[in-house]
Interface confidence: medium
């Protein structure tokens, strides 16, 4: 994040940016930036594998939920969207695309349907779903 | 928006930021930045006037919907929140805090209740509500 004050002095801007303001990113063009993470919601319904491929093609991954505090904007997300959580049948655990295990108490997992993939729904819920069902999806890019 | 390439060369960073990536803002700390506008969702329920005062104290205004394209993140917002739209009884029009008139086809106005203020709901809907009813609210700051 570039200090607004530094950028101001650098470019000798007339407009005074308050010290409490800052830039967010960098993110792909027209993505949402929040607490230095980048998010994009894709309207087109794809299965989990196609959704993953779409995110990867944009140098991102499917949504990873790692912090209720840093990702509290997710509380307000309407509807259901693929996230990067998958079931590992060998050990029965749920893990993210990057191989990390789902931390306890982050998501309420609702395992009523058969499936090895998960939909994100508002208020930090994860609905287990068949990976081949088309759904909208959320891509995420964590800034360095 | 500061060109990622320019900032890269300026600070001689090792990490190469793609040309398509950019910074967003500036915004108040921990606000959502999208297409160079800043948004914050406030959980605390206040009436419309208190909500407006809260936004103003943060150098922002209540949400103004001006473009479905530039504000398409609002499609997926869960629940109902005060926005800066008010009814002008003298001429029967709806206008924003800055005095501009609500553009046609931007919001579907649903007059469920008697009132002169409006709640924003997902998919660009505006619900008419009594201004003194407490609700959560969205503040917005347009970057220069």
């Amino acid at each position: 994040i570039w200090s607004a004050v530094f950028l101001n002095s650098l470019f000798n801007q007339e407009v005074q940016i308050p010290l409490t303001e800052s830039y967010c990113g960098p993110c792909p063009k027209n993505w949402i930036c929040y607490k230095n993470n980048c998010y994009q919601f894709f309207n087109e319904s794809k299965n989990w594998y196609e959704s993953q491929a779409s995110c990867m093609s944009q140098n991102a991954s499917l949504l990873k939920v790692y912090s209720k505090e840093d990702q509290d904007l997710l509380k307000l997300v309407k509807s259901y969207h693929w996230m990067g959580l998958v079931h590992i049948p060998t050990n029965g655990s749920w893990q993210w695309e990057d191989g990390s295990i789902l931390s306890p108490n982050l998501l309420t997992i609702i395992e009523m349907q058969k499936g090895d993939c998960a939909l994100y729904a508002s208020s930090f819920k994860g609905y287990i779903e068949n990976c081949s069902i088309p759904n909208t999806y959320i891509c995420m890019q964590r800034t360095v | 928006i500061w060109s990622a390439v320019f900032l890269n060369s300026l600070f001689n960073q090792e990490v190469q930021i793609p040309l398509t990536e950019s910074y967003c803002g500036p915004c108040p700390k921990n606000w959502i930045c999208y297409k160079n506008n800043c948004y914050q969702f406030f959980n605390e329920s206040k009436n419309w006037y208190e909500s407006q005062a809260s936004c103003m104290s943060q150098n922002a205004s209540l949400l103004k919907v001006y473009s479905k394209e530039d504000q398409d993140l609002l499609k997926l917002v869960k629940s109902y929140h005060w926005m800066g739209l008010v009814h002008i009884p003298t001429n029967g029009s709806w206008q924003w805090e800055d005095g501009s008139i609500l553009s046609p086809n931007l919001l579907t106005i649903i007059e469920m209740q008697k009132g002169d203020c409006a709640l924003y709901a997902s998919s660009f809907k505006g619900y008419i509500e009594n201004c003194s009813i407490p609700n959560t609210y969205i503040c917005m700051q347009r970057t220069v």
């Epitope: 309407k78 259901y80 395992e111 009523m112 349907q113 058969k114 609905y127 779903e129 | 709901a121």
Partner: antibody
Framework: QVQLVESGGGVVQPGRSLRLSCAAS????????MHWVRQAPGKGLEWVAV????????YYADSVKGRFTISRDNSKNTLYLQMNSLRAEDTAVYYC???????????WGQGTLVTVSS | QSVLTQPPSVSEAPRQRVTISCSGS????????VNWYQQLPGKAPKLLIY???LLPSGVSDRFSGSKSGTSASLAISGLQSEDEADYYC???????????FGGGTKLTVL
């Protein structure tokens, strides 16, 4: 197309048992959670129980807990409701309904009437 | 006594608009999706609205749902005689670990 057909209803005395069945067709039954919902004559809908796709998770309404058991046989595409210690207040039309993650009860059967009377 | 509260009946003239309310708590409506079902006389219920305000395919756009906090409402515009039915709101309840319905509202088209 999706079809759910309930059977097994009838007249039964208080304290006795009855088993309802719901035959499913037109979709992959083994992939979906299923519910039972009932409706007493002239009254509203009351949720009874739900079972996950593989039968590992079951939830019941307080009014039937300990008396009713929901189960399924995926090889037969059939959902069951075993009702023991029946009471007059269990008199109702019993519906089975398919659960979908996003739409909840998207398909319903036509119902089977259970009358508990001496 | 239902966990979700609905008015027992509403009535309105043809071509008018009617709204049916549904009141709950943070453990059901406040934190979970609200669905609405229509039950025509002598028929099984039919899904009318899901996830607060979404319409399943085949349902007329005269029906609309909304939710605010722990309350939800169903609006029907351009009322027709075939809309005469019982309408139920419903949601999962995190405290009860079960699905809860409203008591139902009988709509009469005058």
């Amino acid at each position: 197309q999706v079809q759910l057909v309930e059977s097994g209803g009838g007249v039964v005395q208080p304290g006795r048992s009855l088993r309802l069945s719901c035959a499913a067709s037109g979709f992959t039954f083994s992939s979906y959670a299923m519910h039972w919902v009932r409706q007493a004559p002239g009254k509203g809908l009351e949720w009874v129980a739900v079972i996950s796709y593989d039968g590992s998770n079951k939830y019941y309404a307080d009014s039937v807990k300990g008396r009713f058991t929901i189960s399924r046989d995926n090889s037969k595409n059939t959902l069951y409701l075993q009702m023991n210690s029946l009471r007059a207040e269990d008199t109702a039309v019993y519906y089975c309904a398919r659960y979908d993650n996003t739409r909840i009860f998207d398909y319903w059967g036509q119902g089977t009437l259970v009358t508990v009377s001496s | 006594q239902s966990v979700l509260t609905q008015p027992p009946s509403v009535s309105e003239a043809p071509r008018q608009r009617v709204t049916i309310s549904c009141s709950g708590s943070s453990s059901n409506i406040g934190n979970n999706a609200v669905n609405w079902y229509q039950q025509l006389p002598g028929k099984a219920p039919k899904l009318l609205i899901y996830y607060d305000d979404l319409l399943p395919s085949g349902v007329s756009d005269r029906f609309s749902g909304s939710k605010s906090g722990t309350s939800a409402s169903l609006a029907i515009s351009g009322l027709q005689s075939e809309d005469e039915a019982d309408y139920y709101c419903a949601a999962w309840d995190d405290s009860l670990n079960g699905y809860v319905f409203g008591g139902g509202t009988k709509l009469t088209v005058l």
